[in-house]
């Protein structure tokens, strides 16, 4: 089942997968001035069994300029955009990482490819997400987001961080109320209707550092 | 290889300190988060502590006040500053390292050092 | 704070025979992570997010689930199995496991 929307966008962060569920779509998308080649694959696809996980279809781009009398294969522009892309940074991945049962690992790049990939994400993927240099991370909890199927919908959870300048010395946006998001909150079981679990966090300045600690006063 | 180490762990008094060290390597600190979890014997896992990648910290409401987190990226090591110790704080004190950045799942773990808080 | 309540908290079974460990949140959740331990030695990572399996965890086990019950299954118990299972949650904070079933040969 493919995840209806984007993972949630956080200002001044950017997310990334550090593998791909089976199922997941990768656009062959190339950078300005080439397009795919003539009977191309339109995407990649993570297909696997029940040993080893893989990307099905190669990406191959060729430059506009050479001529064919063949008509070629364009992505139009909502094929475009109907992903936003999970890799602002390096598409390579890290070399810790463990690979997964029934995951792909990030694919490797091809020649000429856009400088964004669009993945098209299936329920149960987890992004990551990590600020962009000059911000630095302020956690209620854990900087991730799942896409999951709720009453069959589906939705990404919300990713538990907050970007901030490195000059703003401001508290820990959790004195406040939390604002009611309809992403990330634990949902009723006897409806649909988004509710959220208030807590109170408290916080503390230390040198370059904000500490948040969860009290237990619950609603 | 992803590897993480603990030590410190010891016996101690009553109201006595200790601090525990996480050496960690195969990735730096500066990309993952850190957390703490312990055990008491016979008992269940027990989140303590959790340092993220840049810096911030949470705790357990519980001990919060006498437990402090600390790492040094330079050394890629992980600290648990355990201050007032009672005999409640016996466990085995694992750190443990989500499988994606600031995550939540606990994809690698330490061996675990054994605190003891006895007179 | 959400509480999770694993059931039953031993269950005798012979290798073979399937195993359905339960783990409810007393408030509703996004996603559960499970781990396995055994004496001595620390949690083992066997699922996160539900339903994916961690690194090398055979496919046996599986995981489902929403809101606030889950389910961790194994389709055929291996001698190696016989251990304590861990739920997992951090939807909401702070973090918290479960207390544990514990797996025992009949």
């Known amino acids: 089942e493919l995840c209806d929307d984007d993972p949630p966008e956080i200002p001044h962060a950017t997310f990334k997968a550090m593998a791909y569920k089976e199922g997941t779509m990768l656009n062959c998308e190339c950078k300005r001035g080439f397009r795919r080649i003539k009977s191309g694959s339109l995407y990649m696809l993570c297909t696997g069994n029940s040993s080893h996980s893989s990307w099905d279809n190669q990406c191959q781009c060729t430059s506009s300029a050479t001529r064919n009398t063949t008509k070629q294969v364009t992505p139009q522009p909502e094929e475009q955009k109907e992903r936003k892309t999970t890799e602002m940074q390096s598409p390579m991945q890290p070399v810790d990482q463990a690979s997964l049962p029934g995951h792909c690992r990030e694919p490797p790049p091809w020649e000429n490819e856009a400088t964004e990939r669009i993945y098209h994400f299936v329920v149960g993927q987890m992004v990551y997400y990590q600020c962009v240099q000059g911000y630095r991370a302020l956690h209620r909890g854990p900087a991730e987001s799942v896409c999951k199927m709720t009453h069959g919908k589906t939705r990404w959870t919300q990713p538990q961080l907050i970007c901030t300048g490195e000059m703003e010395t401001s508290q820990f946006p959790g004195e406040e109320k939390p604002q009611a998001s309809p992403e990330g909150r634990p949902e009723s079981e006897t409806s649909c209707l988004v509710t959220t679990t208030d807590f109170q966090i408290q916080t503390e300045m230390a040198a370059t550092m904000e500490t948040s600690i969860f009290t237990t006063e619950y609603q | 290889q992803v590897q993480l180490v603990e030590s410190g762990g010891g016996v101690v008094q009553p109201g006595g300190s200790l601090r525990l060290s996480c050496a960690v390597s195969g990735f730096s600190l500066t990309s993952y988060g850190i957390q703490w979890v312990r055990q008491a014997p016979g008992k269940g896992l027990e989140w303590v502590s959790v340092i993220w990648a840049g810096g911030s910290t949470n705790y357990n409401s519980a001990l919060m006040s006498r437990f402090t987190i600390s790492k040094d990226n330079s050394k890629s090591t992980l600290y648990l500053q355990m201050n007032s110790l009672r005999a409640e704080d016996t466990a085995v004190y694992y750190c443990?390292?989500?499988?994606?950045?600031?995550?939540?799942?606990?994809?690698?773990w330490g061996q675990g050092t054994l605190v003891t808080v006895s007179s | 704070e959400i509480v999770l309540t694993q059931s039953p908290a031993t269950l005798s079974l012979s290798p073979g025979e399937r195993a359905t460990l339960s783990c409810r949140a007393s408030s509703s959740v996004s996603y559960m992570h499970w781990y396995q331990q055994k004496p001595g030695q620390a949690p083992r990572p066997l699922i996160f997010a539900t339903s994916n399996l961690a690194s090398g965890i055979p496919a046996r086990f599986s995981g489902s689930g929403s809101g606030t019950d889950f389910t961790l299954t194994i389709s055929s118990l291996e001698p190696e199995d016989f251990a304590v299972y861990y739920c997992q949650q951090w939807s909401s904070n702070p973090p918290t496991f479960g207390g544990g079933t514990k797996l025992e040969i009949k």
């Open positions: 443990a390292r989500a499988y994606g950045y600031d995550g939540s799942w606990l994809a690698y």
